[in-house]
């Protein structure tokens, strides 16, 4: 019979014959012959192949480097790659999320406008007049100055963008 020019799905053409591809999770050891089947071997620990293939080497699972702020979100199998994600309190430095950095804190005088997510950093804003922040934080907004009047007190020390006002008792006018 004529040697095939094309093979069925999950097969490949080699030496004028159709051989079975190795299933996901296995790599090729030797091609089939007229008398033998394709020989495949399972991928080793921390390796995978996710398609029907004729690869002689499995791929290494992705390494979630803790020194890049990464942790394992989903452990890889012989058929799937590991999925990494950022540690709590860290966010990606790129769309592919190959590295993470700690969320930025807003310095005193600045408050959090938008809390960081896994993919975006903290957005800080300067505290406007009437508001302050005396801490470095990735969560705290600017707080309004204390209203001395509502407490029947007077301002003894004006507030700044970093400090609250200081209230004190009203001076009693002597008769």
């Amino acid at each position: 019979p004529e040697p095939p020019t094309a093979c069925r799905e999950k097969q490949y053409l080699i030496n004028s014959q159709c051989c079975s591809l190795c299933q996901p999770g296995q790599k090729l050891v030797s091609d089939c012959t007229e008398f033998t089947e394709t020989e495949c071997l399972p991928c080793g620990e921390s390796e995978f192949l996710d398609t029907w293939n004729r690869e002689t080497h499995c791929h290494q699972h992705k390494y979630c480097d803790p020194n890049l702020g990464l942790r394992v979100q989903q452990k890889g199998t012989s058929e799937t790659d590991t999925i990494c994600t950022c540690e709590e309190g860290w966010h990606c430095t790129s769309e592919a999320c190959e590295s993470c950095v700690l969320h930025r804190s807003c310095s005193p005088g600045f408050g959090v406008k938008q809390i960081a997510t896994g993919v975006s950093d903290t957005i800080c804003e300067p505290c406007p007049v009437g508001f302050f922040s005396n801490v470095s934080s990735a969560f705290e907004k600017c707080h309004p100055w204390t209203s001395c009047e509502t407490k029947d007190l007077v301002v003894q020390q004006a507030g700044t963008n970093k400090t609250d006002v200081v209230c004190g008792p009203q001076d009693r006018l002597r008769a």
């Epitope: 992705k62 803790p66 190959e98 950095v101 930025r104």
Partner: antibody, heavy 117, light 107 residues
């Protein structure tokens, strides 16, 4: 292809400073930190510190604190290592390396710094 | 700092020999151990990371093992091109520290 290209050899007098550059290409510079390692003649490898161009986060080996400064210019994808108050023991090859998808996965060719009076 | 101690500091073996290099950490480094190869006059090159993961493109005659404080680099069948100095490095805790190196020569 990821490449780190370092500046040329330097000869300095004791007490002087040296600034070594490391120009990165083949990847987005702000994605990964740059590590700095040195190797004295005939000796082993010694980690000096690292710098993350994404947010300028810097970590130093206590041994070099106060003498080494790590910086970067994002516009040119170049990292810098400056070592001050040089002494003869600082004679070494200085390497930059990327902490990429794998630890120290790409290295610069090295910059020889000779400190001699 | 975590101290990394390699042994031997140098060794000579014949082509085809099985070679092992040991690395001991002064405290548990939880498998965060990398191996580098530095050929004479060249730049160090990552061979193995996280104790046993072989970097893509590195020949399969290289392997790594270990846990806790004790780790090993093995070359199953020594080749002439393996002449180099090999360094272990812990990645567990800053500052990163390297072993003093093992110089491998061919008999």
């Amino acid at each position: 292809e990821v490449q780190l290209v370092q500046s040329g050899a330097e000869v300095k007098k004791p007490g002087a400073s040296v600034k070594v550059s490391c120009k990165a290409s083949g990847y987005t510079f702000t994605t990964f930190p740059i590590e700095w390692v040195r190797q004295a003649p005939g000796q082993g490898l010694e980690w000096m510190g690292n710098f993350h161009p994404y947010n300028d986060d810097t970590k130093y080996n206590e041994k070099f604190k106060g003498r080494v400064t790590l910086t970067a210019d994002k516009s040119t994808s170049t990292a810098y290592m400056e070592l001050s108050r040089l002494r003869s023991e600082d004679t070494a090859v200085y390497y930059c390396a990327r902490r990429g998808k794998l630890p120290f996965d790409s290295w610069g060719q090295g910059t020889t710094v000779t400190v001699s009076s | 700092d975590i101290q990394m101690t390699q042994s031997p500091s140098s060794l000579s073996a014949s082509v085809g020999d099985r070679v092992t290099i040991s690395c001991r950490a002064s405290q548990d480094i939880s498998n965060y151990l990398n191996w580098y190869q530095q050929k004479p006059g060249k730049v160090p090159k990552l061979l193995i990371y996280f104790t046993s993961r072989l970097r893509s493109g590195v020949p399969s005659r290289f392997s790594g093992s270990g846990s806790g404080t004790d780790y090993t680099l093995t070359i199953s069948s020594l080749q002439p091109e393996d002449v180099a100095t090999y360094y272990c490095q812990q990645d567990r805790k800053l500052p990163w520290t390297f072993g003093q190196g093992t110089k491998l020569e061919i008999k």
